[in-house]
């Protein structure tokens, strides 16, 4: 009976859900050969991007975990995470506590002139407390990071501060002034909510704004510092004290990085020496004449930082500010985030090892992990095969490239380290879930800081993840030569062991291949591959640039094609590698399935799944993005893949079946 020879429909609930998802997001009345983006994403244009939707699903899963009444072991990490989440959700208690807990914090810091007791304590004492106890850095940032010469050696880095105001160095004066005006209103609100009188609040807020403005003017752009060789300057604490004497560097850093033992001869990495000199001068000037304004500036900054843990009046003030600033910088309004999502994120930040274990146990069991590893192996093998056939690589470069792939570590789902049972069951003994939500947050901030310092101090054979297991961003770490695929990414609709393989290869597989190609991004930079056939490489380069430039863009979409080249190359190559791996899989294994009632062959489903990953609404930020706008991320790679035109029977010369193509990878 020949009818049974074709791929059979997959009718499990996961497949039916996926089919419904595809039907809901696609617009099949559009011709796939001219606008595959609309064919796959037409109805989803107004929705979040597919990654955001998945991130929300993952957070919902964490929410369910945290909301199920479980009989956790008393005092365990799980119990503390659960208690923290619930106290975050208890808005009645937060409202009832009002500003009391915050005012207590302000008093501990020596008070301020706006309200409450003012004890005019030592400037460096306040700064030391802010840095070490509250994780707040008003004048500069200090953090542990890799030593520029030895990425596995941690070293204290002193960097420019992060301003709460979204200032850019190329901002026109009018916008700059408007931003500060809105921010002044916000600071006035904070001071008033904390009991201050308008006259005092305005006086202190205005001075705080002027301090911020002056500090901002001291910053030097990254490119300028890089060009002058001043982006990584090794200095000792003693030398720093000489350059910027207003700060008691040793005591502030010692308190912040306990239990590290620091001495005046300790070396640090400084990222903007000139800024620190000017900042110190400003502080000294203010300590002479306006000590209390300096204190208010520091306290206001802390209040801004802590406002998410405060009552609804503070949240509302913050929301209004964000809305105004987005209008000024011509960004679309931010959709309101529900309380549960904020609480899940906070809990995830402070109790990551515990939540990682709970999430992975539920969302990325052994069978899913094993299927994901098999998929990765297939993709990696296809890449190795492909490297042998690149016209611009000579044999020596090919061997080097293959070795690089062979030595690559992969971390799938969650880091081995994070899933160690003793870590997952961590008891967080130093966390006191206090009488108020703010106190609980502060206790968690201190605990997290201590854990970060400890983790840097321990010899760490494994890669330290930059994302949480429930995140949706894969990445390649150059320094550790490891590629990371968090469990949160390898979820429906991108991946499921029960999906047709076309879906897994087209969606998750192309993401994996894309990340693998980032191993070689250095080769694509000018002069990055001396042993390559640079003429052929240059030709492929130009060809790809021209290919992308030829695509029409939807109205009001802009992007910078010099920023996006490397990502475009990884998109095109990633799709080709995933397709090669999938084709090989089809040849070797029969029994492929399809999604019912979509009327798409396995190969068509492969491309449909690839496009699904890219579904999202273009946004104004695309002009600063290293990725192309979503239309291009679909059409660029599909039009570069002859198989696409073959399987969708596209007429020669159609937009997605051009007469000539480029091959970089």
């Amino acid at each position: 009976n020949f009818q049974n020879c074709g791929p059979r429909p997959c009718e499990t609930s996961v497949c039916l859900d996926l089919r419904d998802h595809y039907l809901a997001s696609g617009n099949t009345s559009v011709a796939p050969c001219t606008d595959f983006f609309s064919f796959a994403c037409g109805r989803a244009k107004e929705t979040n991007n597919s990654f955001q939707e998945l991130a929300t699903k993952n957070k919902n899963r964490l929410r369910r975990i945290l909301e199920v009444q479980n009989s956790w072991h008393p005092g365990s990490g799980e119990e503390k995470a659960f208690q923290f989440y619930n106290s975050c959700m208890d808005t009645l208690a937060i409202e009832a506590a009002g500003t009391g807990p915050l005012r207590q914090v302000i008093e501990e810091l020596g008070g301020w002139r706006i309200s409450g007791k003012w004890t005019s304590l030592n400037f460096n004492r306040t700064l030391r407390l802010l840095m070490s106890q509250y994780g707040h850095f008003p004048f500069f940032r200090a953090y542990l990071g890799p030593h520029p010469a030895s990425p596995h050696t941690p070293v204290i880095q002193i960097d420019q501060p992060e301003f709460d105001v979204p200032l850019k160095q190329d901002q026109e004066q009018k916008i700059y002034a408007q931003i500060f005006r809105e921010y002044l209103t916000y600071l006035n609100q904070l001071g008033t909510l904390l009991g201050g009188d308008p006259s005092k609040v305005q006086e202190h807020s205005s001075l705080s704004i002027s301090i911020t403005s002056r500090l901002f003017q001291f910053l030097r752009p990254l490119e300028q510092r890089r060009a002058q060789g001043k982006l990584f300057q090794m200095v000792t604490i003693d030398q720093l004290k000489e350059m910027a004497p207003a700060i008691d560097w040793l005591s502030c850093l010692q308190a912040t990085f306990t239990p590290m033992s620091l001495s005046p001869s300790q070396s640090l990495v400084v990222h903007d020496v000139e800024y620190l000199k000017n900042m110190s001068q400003l502080v000294e000037e203010m300590l002479l004449k306006q000590r209390d304004f300096l204190q208010s500036h520091m306290i206001l900054g802390l209040v801004v930082t802590l406002s998410p843990a405060l009552d609804s009046q503070f949240q509302e003030a913050r929301r209004k500010l964000s809305q105004k600033l987005r209008e000024l910088t011509e960004q679309p309004p931010m959709p309101a985030r529900p309380r549960w999502m904020k609480c899940v994120e906070e809990t995830g930040t402070f109790f990551e090892p515990t939540l990682a274990a709970l999430f992975v146990r539920e969302a990325f069991g052994p069978s899913t992990r094993s299927a994901a590893m098999k998929l990765f192996t297939a993709i990696r093998d296809a890449l190795i095969t492909r490297l042998r056939n690149l016209p611009w690589m000579n044999e020596e470069t090919q061997n080097m490239a293959q070795d690089k792939v062979a030595q690559l570590q992969v971390e799938m789902g969650a880091s081995e380290w994070a899933l160690k049972p003793e870590l997952a069951r961590q008891e967080y003994n130093d966390i006191q879930l206090g009488s108020s939500f703010l106190q609980s947050v502060l206790s968690c901030v201190r605990s997290l800081r201590a854990r970060i310092v400890q983790s840097f101090l321990q010899p760490h054979p494994q890669h330290r993840w930059k994302v949480s297991p429930w995140d949706v961003n894969a990445y390649y770490s150059v320094s550790d030569h490891v590629v990371v695929f968090p469990a949160g990414l390898l979820q429906p609709p991108f991946f499921h062991p029960g999906y047709p393989r076309a879906v897994n290869f087209g969606a998750a597989g192309s993401i994996m291949a894309h990340e693998l190609l980032h191993i070689f991004y250095q080769l694509l930079l000018p002069g990055g591959c001396l042993a390559c056939d640079n003429h052929a490489l240059q030709e492929a380069h130009l060809c790809l640039k021209r290919h992308y430039a030829a695509f029409p863009l939807p109205s009001r979409t802009s992007f910078n094609d010099s920023l996006t080249f490397l990502e475009n190359a990884a998109d095109v190559g990633g799709l080709a590698i995933a397709l090669q791996a999938y084709s090989k899989r089809l040849l070797r294994h029969h029994g492929e399935t399809v999604l019912p009632s979509l009327d798409l062959s396995p190969q068509q489903i492969f491309f449909r799944s690839y496009a699904q990953v890219m579904c999202r609404k273009p946004s104004p930020q695309d002009s600063h993005d290293t990725h192309s706008p979503p239309h291009l991320r679909v059409h660029g790679p599909l039009s570069s893949t002859p198989a696409f035109a073959r399987y969708f029977r596209c007429a020669r010369g159609a937009l997605l079946n051009p007469s000539s193509r480029c091959q970089l990878w």
Epitope: G116, W118, G195, D197, P198
Partner: antibody
Framework: QVQLKESGPGLLAPSQSLSITCTVS????????VYWVRQPPGKGLEWLGI???????NYQSVLRSRLSITKDDSKSQVFLKLNSLQTDDTATYYC??????????WGQGTLVTVSA | DIVLTQSPASLAVSLGQRAIISCKAS??????????MHWYQQRPGQQPKLLIY???NLEAGVPTRFSGSGSRTDFTLNIHPVEEDDAATYYC?????????FGGGTRLEIK
């Protein structure tokens, strides 16, 4: 607890100067503002001026030329001085602490009569 | 200066009934969203006593029979149910800008 007590001269003649001391306890004058309010017999309340924790002052506009408010933080005392008295300066003079959120703590008041 | 006009100048209310006192400002007393209007009670021969601060916040120890509402230029003090003890003069006061000012007062008499 917070307490404020005014002490004044009672009776003064026109053109003389009025000096009242407000002695406080239960809080520090470096942290909080203290203001003065007066109330003529059988009439309403009139705000006179304030001295803040940092020593800065704000005054009622019509009295600015005749009025000064000073303090001695170490003695926890605030002083009101009103020059060139007229009979319509007759009133009960109150000092009050400006607490956070404008929560106020008042003294008992001291009656000052200006009479020829 | 911000002028505060209280009405009525006096009112007589039966025990257990509701007393409503209004205070209108000549310009807004709102600063960045917070209305800086306060209410005082003054019994004969005593200093004024704060009842409500910043429009609607009850001072510690003040019975919940007292409540305040309003925004920008129009404010109200509500007393319900009125008790014998509430016979006094009531003043509104603004601290939005200098000079701080008081309303002319409302005398409440219990019938």
């Amino acid at each position: 607890q917070v307490q404020l007590k005014e002490s004044g001269p009672g009776l003064l003649a026109p053109s003389q100067s009025l000096s009242i001391t407000c002695t406080v306890s239960g809080f520090s004058l470096t942290s909080y503002g203290v203001y003065w309010v007066r109330q003529p017999p059988g009439k309403g309340l009139e705000w006179l001026g304030i001295i803040w924790g940092d020593g800065s002052t704000n005054y009622q506009s019509v009295l600015r030329s005749r009025l000064s408010i000073t303090k001695d933080d170490s003695k926890s005392q605030v002083f009101l001085k009103l020059n060139s008295l007229q009979t319509d300066d007759t009133a009960t003079y109150y000092c009050a602490k400006r607490g956070d959120y404008d929560v106020a703590y008042w003294g008992q008041g001291t009656l000052v009569t200006v009479s020829a | 200066d911000i002028v505060l006009t209280q009405s009525p100048a006096s009112l007589a209310v039966s025990l257990g009934q509701r007393a409503i006192i209004s205070c209108k400002a000549s310009q807004t007393v709102s600063f960045v969203g917070t209305s800086l209007m306060h209410w005082y009670q003054q019994r004969p021969g005593q200093q004024p006593k704060l009842l409500i601060y910043r429009t609607s916040n009850l001072e510690a120890g003040v019975p919940t029979r007292f409540s305040g509402s309003g925004s920008r230029t129009d404010f109200t003090l509500n007393i319900h149910p009125v008790e014998e003890d509430d016979a006094a003069t009531y003043y509104c006061q603004q601290s939005r800008e200098f000079p701080w000012t008081f309303g002319g007062g409302t005398r409440l008499e219990i019938k």
